[in-house]
C-alpha cells in the first residue's frame, strides 16, 4: 500500500507539521494608502511573520493547498462622527480571496458595524472588528483585507490592527 | 540523511501532536483583584484546562517554544457611565507577553472600544471584546491579558470571560 | 516498545492530520426559522464544508474526542430600536453543547451587546459579535449557535454570520 | 466597607430651598458607583430623586427634574441635593445611597440612615 | 416612566413558611431588578441584585427569578426576622422605579 509504505511521505508529513503555515502580519503607517486597494501589512518587523506562507500587495498568498484559519483585526476610532457616517455607511470589515479562477474577488468573512454612535457624549469614539474562520485555499490563492472606510483604522504600532492564518 | 532516519524523531512528532499545547482558562469571582494587576482566571474548574501549558499568577506560560493562537475574550458592562467613561476613557482589552529579556510587559495584541454609549434608552449596557492571533513564544515566557477598566468585565460565570492558546 | 514500534499508528497519525476534523457552516436564508431553536446552517454550498464532523439540525456534530476551537460570528442589524430592544434585552449570542449525558444545553462561550443604540443619527444600524475558544468534546457531542433575539441576524450571502470548528 | 451619612436641616418652609449631603467615609467617591437620593414619604414608598457620579454627570427623575440640582465635591468625598420650591408634598425621610455600576455586580448596596425633613412654615 | 407591580400588597405568614412574592414591570427590563427589605425606622437593604444574584451576607433563604417583565422573590423557610416590606426595584431605564411595597406580617 502506497500510503502506509512510503517512509519519505512520512517524513513529508513530520515535516509540513514542523513547518504548518502560518502568518501574522501587523498594521503599519502605510498599511492604509487611501486608493481603494486593499489595506497593506508589515510582514517582517516587531511580531509581524510568515512561515509557509508569502504576501504580495496587501495579501497574503498560500504556497500549499489547504484549509486555513485566517483572521483579521482593525482598531476603528474617530473624531465625531464624519457626515452622515452613522445614517449613510457602516463600516464594512472584510476578508476575500483572490485567485486566477475568478476575475473579481470573492468574498470570505465580511462584518459591517455603526461604530461611530457608541460614545455618548464624545467627540472620539473607539471600536473594534475581528473576523476568522476556516476556508480553503489552493496554492498561490490570496487573501486580502479591505476596510471601505480605511481612513477610520488605526495602524499605530501593530497590536491594534492585524492579519493572519494558520493552516488547520 | 538524519533528518529522515530518525524513528524517534518521527515517533516524537507524533506525540507532541498528540498533545500539542492548548489551554482554556474562564472567568471566575477571584479574577478582578482591583490591584492594576493582570486579570487572574480558573485553570481545572468547568470549561478551563491546561495542557501542555502552565499557569502562574494569570498568565499562561509556555513550556516548549513556537507559534501561538492566543485569544482572549471579555464581556463587559455597567450601569450607564459614571466615569463619563465615554468621554474620558475607552475600555482598553489587551494580550500582553512577560519575558525574562525585557524589563516591561510587550503589548501583542490590544483593542479599545467606547461601550458605554451604546445602549439607546437603557441605563444598562453590555459590550463583549474579542481578541485572537498568532504569536511566536519561546519556553518559558508569559502571557497575560489585562483591561484597564477592569471593573467594568464580568467574569462571574466563565461562559463570557476566558483566555486560551494553542500552538500551530 | 509499542508506542514506538506501530508503523500503522504512525500512518494513522499522519491520516489524522492530513484529514484534523475542521468545518466551517455559513448562514443562508433558512437559518432563522423563528421557533427559538438553534440557527440553521449551509453545509455544502460556497464556502461551507465538513470535514471529519457531521452536521444535525443547527449542530456540528464530533465523530472524535478532542479539544476543538469552536467559533461564530453573526451579523446583526436592524431599523431602529424595536419598541423596548434596548430596553428589554441585550442581544445574546452563544454556542452551546449537546450531550447525552446532561438534559440541557451547556453554555461553552457567550457574549450580550446592547446594539441598537449605537448608530447615533441612523435608523439603521449594525453590529457583529465573535466568539471562539478551545472546549473539550466527546465523540458524538453537538455544538450549537443561539441567538435570543434572532430577528436581529443578518444571514444573507454566508460570508456574514458563520460558525465552525476544528481540533487543535 | 464604605458608610454614607446624609445631614442637613430638618425643617425647611414652603417655597424654600431643601439641601442635603451626603458624606462617603471608608471609600472613595471617584469610584464606578452611581451616588443616588431616594425619598420617603411616611407611611408610603421609595421614591428616586435622581444620580449623580463623581465625574458630575447627573439624571434626574423627570417630575422633580426642574427643581433638583445634584453635585459632587470630591475634595470632600461629599455629594449633595438641592430641591427649590418645596411644598408640603416633598416631606419626607431622604435617603443616600451608592449605586454599584460595575458588570458583575449592580444594586443600591450602601444606604444612609436616612434624614427627616419636613416642609412646613 | 416603567412601573411595577407587586403582589400582594400584604400577607400574613408564619415562621417556616414558604413566602412568595411576585413583582411585574410595565415593560420588558431584562434581568435588571432588584429586591429591597425594609424595617420600620431603617433604611432599604439590598437582598437580591439582576434578578438572581444574591447580595454578599445575605441568607440563601431568599432567592430571586424572572427575566422580562415578571419576577419573583422567594423565602424559603420564615424567620422572625423576616417580617418587613419588601420592594422590587427596576435600575434598567430612567427614571428608577420601585414596586409599591409587600407588607409581610406574623400570621
Known amino acids: 500500500d502506497q500510503d502506509t509504505g512510503s517512509w519519505e511521505q512520512l517524513v513529508q508529513a513530520r515535516r509540513s507539521h514542523k513547518a504548518s503555515p502560518a502568518a501574522h502580519l501587523t498594521g503599519a503607517n502605510s498599511s492604509s494608502m487611501g486608493t481603494g486597494g486593499p489595506l497593506l501589512w508589515e510582514t517582517q518587523l516587531g511580531l509581524a511573520f510568515l512561515r509557509g506562507l508569502g504576501y504580495h500587495d496587501g495579501a497574503l498568498v498560500t504556497t500549499q493547498a489547504g484549509y486555513y484559519y485566517i483572521y483579521s483585526k482593525v482598531q476603528l476610532g474617530g473624531v465625531g462622527c464624519p457626515q452622515g457616517l452613522a445614517t449613510d455607511l457602516p463600516v464594512t470589515h472584510g476578508l476575500y480571496k483572490r485567485t486566477t479562477r475568478y476575475p473579481e474577488e470573492l468574498e470570505l468573512l465580511v462584518s459591517r458595524r455603526s461604530p461611530c454612535g457608541r460614545a455618548a457624549s464624545s467627540r472620539v469614539w473607539w471600536d473594534s472588528s475581528f473576523l476568522g474562520g476556516v476556508v480553503h485555499l489552493e496554492a498561490g490563492e490570496e487573501v486580502v483585507v479591505r476596510v471601505l472606510e480605511e481612513q477610520l483604522v488605526r495602524l499605530r504600532d501593530g497590536t491594534r490592527s492585524y492579519f493572519g492564518a494558520f493552516m488547520v | 540523511d538524519q533528518d529522515t532516519g530518525s524513528w524517534e524523531q518521527l515517533v516524537q512528532a507524533r506525540r507532541s501532536h498528540k498533545a500539542s499545547p492548548a489551554a482554556h482558562l474562564t472567568g471566575a469571582n477571584s479574577s478582578s483583584m482591583g490591584t492594576g494587576g493582570p486579570l487572574l482566571w480558573e485553570t481545572q474548574l468547568g470549561l478551563a484546562f491546561l495542557r501542555g501549558l502552565g499557569y502562574h499568577d494569570g498568565a499562561l506560560v509556555t513550556t516548549q517554544a513556537g507559534y501561538y493562537y492566543i485569544y482572549s475574550k471579555v464581556q463587559l458592562g455597567g450601569v450607564g457611565c459614571p466615569q463619563g467613561l465615554a468621554t474620558d476613557l475607552p475600555v482598553t482589552h489587551g494580550l500582553y507577553k512577560r519575558t525574562t529579556r525585557y524589563p516591561e510587559e510587550l503589548e501583542l495584541l490590544v483593542s479599545r472600544r467606547s461601550p458605554c454609549g451604546r445602549a439607546a434608552s437603557s441605563r444598562v449596557w453590555w459590550d463583549s471584546s474579542f481578541l485572537g492571533g498568532v504569536v511566536h513564544l519561546e519556553a518559558g515566557e508569559e502571557v497575560v491579558v489585562r483591561v484597564l477598566e477592569e471593573q467594568l468585565v464580568r467574569l462571574r460565570d466563565g461562559t463570557r470571560s476566558y483566555f486560551g492558546a494553542f500552538m500551530v | 516498545d509499542q508506542d514506538t514500534g506501530s508503523w500503522e499508528q504512525l500512518v494513522q497519525a499522519r491520516r489524522s492530520h492530513k484529514a484534523s476534523p475542521a468545518a466551517h457552516l455559513t448562514g443562508a436564508n433558512s437559518s432563522s426559522m423563528g421557533t427559538g431553536g438553534p440557527l440553521l446552517w449551509e453545509t455544502q454550498l460556497g464556502l461551507a464544508f465538513l470535514r471529519g464532523l457531521g452536521y444535525h439540525d443547527g449542530a456540528l456534530v464530533t465523530t472524535q474526542a478532542g479539544y476543538y476551537y469552536i467559533y461564530s460570528k453573526v451579523q446583526l442589524g436592524g431599523v431602529g430600536c424595536p419598541q423596548g430592544l434596548a430596553t428589554d434585552l441585550p442581544v445574546t449570542h452563544g454556542l452551546y453543547k449537546r450531550t447525552t449525558r446532561y438534559p440541557e444545553e451547556l453554555e461553552l462561550l457567550v457574549s450580550r451587546r446592547s446594539p441598537c443604540g449605537r448608530a447615533a443619527s441612523s435608523r439603521v444600524w449594525w453590529d457583529s459579535s465573535f466568539l471562539g475558544g478551545v472546549v473539550h468534546l466527546e465523540a458524538g457531542e453537538e455544538v450549537v449557535v443561539r441567538v435570543l433575539e434572532e430577528q436581529l441576524v443578518r444571514l444573507r450571502d454566508g460570508t456574514r454570520s458563520y460558525f465552525g470548528a476544528f481540533m487543535v | 466597607q464604605v458608610q454614607l451619612q446624609e445631614s442637613g436641616p430638618g425643617l425647611v418652609k414652603p417655597s424654600g430651598t431643601l439641601s442635603l449631603t451626603c458624606a462617603v467615609s471608608?471609600?472613595?467617591?471617584?469610584?464606578?458607583?452611581?451616588w443616588n437620593w431616594v425619598r420617603q414619604p411616611p407611611g408610603k414608598g421609595l421614591e428616586w430623586i435622581g444620580e449623580?457620579?463623581?465625574?458630575?454627570?447627573?439624571n434626574y427623575n423627570p417630575s422633580l427634574k426642574s427643581r433638583v440640582t445634584m453635585s459632587v465635591d470630591k475634595a470632600k468625598n461629599q455629594f449633595s441635593l438641592k430641591l427649590n420650591s418645596v411644598t408640603a408634598a416633598d416631606t419626607a425621610v431622604y435617603y443616600c445611597?451608592?449605586?454599584?455600576?460595575?458588570?458583575?455586580?449592580?444594586?443600591?448596596?450602601?444606604w444612609g440612615q436616612g434624614t427627616t425633613v419636613t416642609v412646613s412654615s | 416612566a416603567i412601573q411595577l407591580t407587586q403582589s400582594p400588597s400584604s400577607l400574613s405568614a408564619s415562621v417556616g413558611d414558604r413566602v412568595t412574592i411576585t413583582c411585574r414591570a410595565s415593560?420588558?427590563?431584562?434581568?435588571?431588578l432588584a429586591w429591597f427589605q425594609q424595617k420600620p425606622g431603617k433604611p432599604p437593604k439590598l437582598l437580591i441584585f439582576?434578578?438572581?444574584d444574591l447580595e454578599s451576607g445575605v441568607s440563601s433563604r431568599f432567592s430571586g427569578s424572572g427575566s422580562g417583565t415578571d419576577f419573583t422573590l422567594t423565602i424559603s423557610s420564615l424567620q422572625p426576622g423576616d417580617f418587613a416590606t419588601y420592594y422590587c426595584?427596576?435600575?434598567?431605564?430612567?427614571?428608577?422605579?420601585f414596586g409599591q411595597g409587600t407588607r409581610l406580617e406574623i400570621k
Open positions: 445611597a451608592r449605586e454599584r455600576a460595575v458588570a458583575d455586580y449592580h444594586g443600591m448596596d450602601v
Open positions: 471608608g471609600g472613595s467617591i471617584s469610584s464606578i458607583n452611581w
Open positions: 449623580v457620579s463623581h465625574s458630575g454627570i447627573t
Open positions: 415593560q420588558g427590563i431584562s434581568s435588571a
Open positions: 439582576d434578578a438572581s
Open positions: 426595584q427596576q435600575f434598567n431605564s430612567y427614571p428608577i422605579t
